[in-house]
């Protein structure tokens, strides 16, 4: 007897972090035997959507013409073949930005820091929030997060970096969010360029240099003072 149908692959284009009002396409790829594709969204009545396969029947397109809060969340897809329904795909987390006003990102004591010294990136929001996220452009694991303990809401979060090396240099943005939906983020802060000077391997780095995507300090959980470590956002959500 044949085993369970292989699970399909689920992804989003142009990506899984979408600004409010922008379009996004969710793709589910199964097998050539697929007769129907179904998309389910966690914590919502099912089925979320159903589509007939596109030729040659091994995938289906689920279109979101304008991103809103209703569409943010965690999705899985399935396909139906003549022998039944497939296993669910791995989850896709669709995040919407623009749900709240943008926070302010600053560096203390300065965005120009000497290698080996310490710097703290400070993300501040106008209204109290309970989750703050720091993103570094082109990092291998760009999302780092700091959540208030016990759901307490606050206006800022500190992301300390010590000791700083040249790998910490680059462009950062931060977001804020409420705990009731991890999938709704604020507008992004204005970018902050962190410039690391004085290191032997990179004495005068250019602010516009590309940032390495190899594992480095930016890939490690930052350790906020007096709080538990916070890990990559995806690991936290799952």
């Amino acid at each position: 007897q044949a085993g369970p149908l292989p699970k399909p692959t689920l992804w989003a284009e142009p990506g899984s972090v979408i600004s409010w009002g922008n379009s996004v396409t969710i793709w589910c790829q199964g097998t050539l035997e697929a007769r129907e594709y179904r998309l389910d969204k966690e914590e919502s009545p099912a089925p979320w959507d159903r589509q007939n396969p596109l030729e040659p029947k091994n995938k289906a397109r689920f279109s979101i013409p304008s991103m809103t809060e209703d569409y943010a969340g965690r999705y899985r897809c399935y396909y139906r073949s003549p022998v039944g329904w497939s296993q669910p795909s791995d989850p896709l987390e669709l995040v919407m930005t623009g749900a709240y006003s943008k926070p302010t990102l600053s560096a203390l004591p300065s965005p120009l820091v000497t290698s080996g010294k310490s710097v703290t990136l400070l993300c501040q929001s106008r209204s109290p929030m309970d989750t703050f996220l720091l993103i570094k452009e082109r990092a291998a694991h760009p999302l780092l997060h700091l959540r208030s303990e016990h759901g307490a809401q606050q206006h800022q979060a500190e992301f300390p970096m010590s000791p700083v090396t040249s790998v910490h240099g680059g462009t950062y943005r931060c977001f804020s969010s409420h705990g009731f939906s991890h999938y709704l983020l604020s507008h992004p802060s204005d970018p902050l360029e962190l410039i690391v000077s004085g290191s032997l391997e990179d004495p005068r780095p250019s602010p516009t240099r590309s940032v390495s995507t190899a594992a480095g300090p930016e890939d490690q959980p930052l350790m906020p003072t007096g709080s538990v470590p916070h890990s990559g956002l995806r690991r936290h959500w799952e």
């Epitope: 009545p45 089925p47 979320w48």
Partner: nanobody
Framework: EVQLVESGGGLVQPGGSLRLSCAAS????????MGWYRQAPGKQRELVAA???????KIGDSVKGRFTISRDNAKNSVYLQMNSLRAEDTAVYYC???????????????WGQGTQVTVSS
């Protein structure tokens, strides 16, 4: 062939209760979110409640705490229990079926003919 058939509408006093039923064909019921819309004279159609094949429900803000929705898989039927009825609940109530995203877009795939609910003393 009529695929969604509503029943249970009528005249009820303010504060009273009513239970609407919708019978569906098995093929529609087994693979769709089932729900209820309503439309009052001169107003837009609005989603009242919906329930998925996974049992999860969505209740409209205007009826939260007063209306509940349930589905009976053995009878291919969905029910809307309406309590603490108000004059503003007066409308034609429509049974609907489709994927949930169609409910968000106010365009389910299947519609019933509607049943009148009038709340008046």
């Amino acid at each position: 062939e009529v695929q969604l058939v509503e029943s249970g509408g009528g005249l009820v006093q303010p504060g009273g209760s009513l239970r609407l039923s919708c019978a569906a064909s098995e093929s529609i019921f087994s693979s769709n979110v089932m729900g209820w819309y309503r439309q009052a004279p001169g107003k837009q159609r609005e989603l009242v409640a919906a329930v998925g094949i996974n049992g999860l429900t969505k209740i409209g803000d205007s009826v939260k705490g007063r209306f509940t929705i349930s589905r009976d898989n053995a009878k291919n039927s969905v029910y809307l229990q309406m309590n603490s009825l108000r004059a503003e609940d007066t409308a034609v109530y429509y049974c609907a079926a489709g994927a949930y995203v169609r409910f968000l877009q106010n365009s389910p795939d299947y519609w019933g003919q509607g049943t009148q609910v009038t709340v008046s003393s």
